[in-house]
């Protein structure tokens, strides 16, 4: 009945509703049917959120912060539904809401505790800073403060730097990890305990490849089954690092099954893509193709980074010409 938020029953006519920032929610309240229905929703026992009586809304005294954001299920009132439809919740809306329902038979009050969470999709980035390599797990907007854990080769790491900036309604968090010289795999997990939502970033470095000029190279990129769910929307991006910045070679969007290729020598095997294998080929290698190649598979719940180092060496003919 209440599809836009999940709520937990707790004692004493009190329920907890968990909403997401900027989404719509329903604060539930029901009563025994009766004539002359009066409904008053209040926030923190002080601010008028919504009033209904004598068959219509009376919003003259409504607190301005709720203007055009609340409504009742008018066709359901006679069936005992006093629930409040609440549009675009913000973190300032968190708190206790009291629903007063009176009829000619009885008066009841229900309390609803609204908690609001934020979890904008995090990202895992691979960065070069001078001679150092960093993995950075970051989330632009999150509330409440998340739990961030790092693992190296599936073993938890205690070292966990967190750069945190707080705004009025959420936190922005960066968690960098220096992985210079490491061949290990790394995993970063960001958990929002309120929204019961977890995101995982996984980074794997493949063995370096040595290729001759004019040859082609095949670089593997297959998602780990633990995270990957093919019926969930995701994006695959192949990019190459040049002078500290990545340039995109190609990307694939699962929602539209679209492939966009920016490098004419790049090829993707459509049949492999259909089997969730995003390995790529780069033809006709030249010396400037040496570098790091990054495959990024990302969805709302994970980012899987696979990095390949390619060394392109001059072919014998090129060497003899010199």
């Amino acid at each position: 009945i209440f599809p836009l938020a999940f709520f937990i029953y707790v004692p004493m006519n009190e329920q907890i509703v968990i909403g997401r920032l900027d989404e719509d929610i329903i604060l539930p309240s029901s009563f025994e049917r009766g004539s002359e229905v009066v409904i008053h929703w209040k926030y923190q026992d002080s601010y008028k959120v919504h009033s209904y009586y004598k068959g219509s809304d009376h919003l003259e005294s409504q607190d301005p912060r709720y203007a055009n954001r609340t409504s009742l299920f008018y066709n359901e009132i006679q069936n005992g539904n006093a629930s409040l439809f609440f549009r675009r919740v913000s973190l300032l809306d968190e708190g206790i809401y009291t629903c007063y329902v009176g009829t000619a038979i009885q008066v009841i009050t229900n309390k609803v505790v609204l908690k609001v969470g934020v979890f904008l999709t995090p990202v895992m980035k691979y960065e070069k800073r001078n001679t150092n390599s960093f993995l950075i797990c970051s989330v632009l907007s999150v509330y409440p403060r998340p739990i961030i854990t790092w693992k190296m080769d599936n073993t938890p790491i205690s070292e966990n730097n967190m750069e945190e900036t707080g705004s009025l309604d959420s936190f922005s968090i960066n968690s960098p990890l220096n992985i210079t010289g490491s061949n290990s795999s790394y995993e970063c997990t960001i958990e929002n305990s309120l929204l019961k939502q977890t995101w995982t970033g996984r980074w794997t470095m493949k063995d370096g490849l040595h290729k001759m000029q004019s040859e082609h190279v095949s670089l593997s990129c297959q998602p780990v089954n633990d995270y990957f769910s093919p019926n969930q929307d995701f994006k695959v991006t192949w990019s190459r690092m040049k002078s500290g910045t990545f340039s995109v070679l190609a990307y694939y969007l699962s929602s539209s099954q679209n492939t966009i290729i920016n490098e004419s020598r790049f090829s993707w095997n459509k049949e492999l893509i259909n089997q969730s294998d995003f390995s790529m080929n780069l033809m006709d290698l030249n010396l400037s193709d040496s570098g790091e190649y990054l495959c990024n598979i990302s969805s709302d719940e994970y980012t899987l980074l696979t990095i390949h180092t390619v060394h392109v060496e001059p072919s014998q003919e090129t060497a003899s010409h010199n």
Epitope: E36, V38, H40, Y53, V107
Partner: antibody
Framework: QVQLVESGGGVVQPGRSLRLSCAAS????????MHWVRQVPGKGLEWVAV????????DYADSVKGRFTISRDNSKNTLYLQMNSLRVEDTAVYYC?????????????WGQGTLVTVSS | DIQMTQSPSSLSASVGDRVTITCRAS??????LAWYQQKPGKVPKLLIY???TLQSGVPSRFSGSGSGTDFTLTISSLQPEDVATYYC?????????FGPGTKVDIK
């Protein structure tokens, strides 16, 4: 059963003040609106004031606006009427009355009343 | 503010008679009208609300009708215990004004 007992009435001079109280029992006081209604002996009923269940709204008859203040203490189950600048024409029996619901309906229970006499 | 008038201001009727009292509002008040009975020396008692709904415990000889501006209270068969003053009250919005009352007695 609902019981409303008014007190605080008496004889007072014009221009003076008086505070009426109404002790409520037999129902959840904090859930209901409350009214004061007055009646000059031998005359008709005159609605004086209403206060919502949570005291968030109050309304007054034009004849008492600015002079009378209705209030309530839900923790004490008590309704009040503070009457200032009393006039001879305020002489009446003052009834405390319970609203059907929150303070926007009719009176469904009445107290016995307390007599206020304004006289020099 | 909306004014309430009642007619007649008083009436005498015989036991068993049908008695009708009229209440008029100066502006429409939908069906937000209540009727009260006040017997001599007693406090008022609610008879009818929402213009036509009988309060529980009130004898069925009392009935109410009307909507908008014109309302009536009818006693289908007057009884000695019905001697009282009857008041209408509007409650669509404050001020919740009473009518001036109609005094009913037995001939």
């Amino acid at each position: 059963q609902v019981q409303l007992v008014e007190s605080g009435g008496g004889v007072v001079q014009p221009g003076r003040s008086l505070r009426l109280s109404c002790a409520a029992s037999g129902f959840t006081f904090s859930n209901y609106g409350m009214h004061w209604v007055r009646q000059v002996p031998g005359k008709g009923l005159e609605w004086v004031a209403v206060i919502w269940y949570d005291a968030s709204e109050k309304d007054y008859a034009d004849s008492v606006k600015g002079r009378f203040t209705i209030s309530r203490d839900n923790s004490k189950n008590t309704l009040y009427l503070q009457m200032n600048s009393l006039r001879v024409e305020d002489t009446a029996v003052y009834y405390c009355a319970k609203d059907l619901i929150s303070g926007i309906y009719y009176v469904d229970h009445w107290g016995q009343g307390t007599l206020v006499t304004v006289s020099s | 503010d909306i004014q309430m008038t009642q007619s007649p201001s008083s009436l005498s009727a015989s036991v068993g008679d049908r008695v009708t009292i009229t209440c008029r509002a100066s502006q429409g008040i939908s069906n937000y009208l209540a009727w009260y009975q006040q017997k001599p020396g007693k406090v008022p008692k609610l008879l009818i609300y929402a213009a036509s709904t009988l309060q529980s415990g009130v004898p069925s000889r009392f009935s109410g009708s009307g909507s908008g501006t014109d309302f009536t209270l009818t006693i289908s068969s007057l009884q000695p215990e019905d001697v009282a003053t009857y008041y209408c009250q509007k409650y669509n919005s404050a001020p919740f004004t009473f009518g001036p009352g109609t005094k009913v007695d037995i001939k």
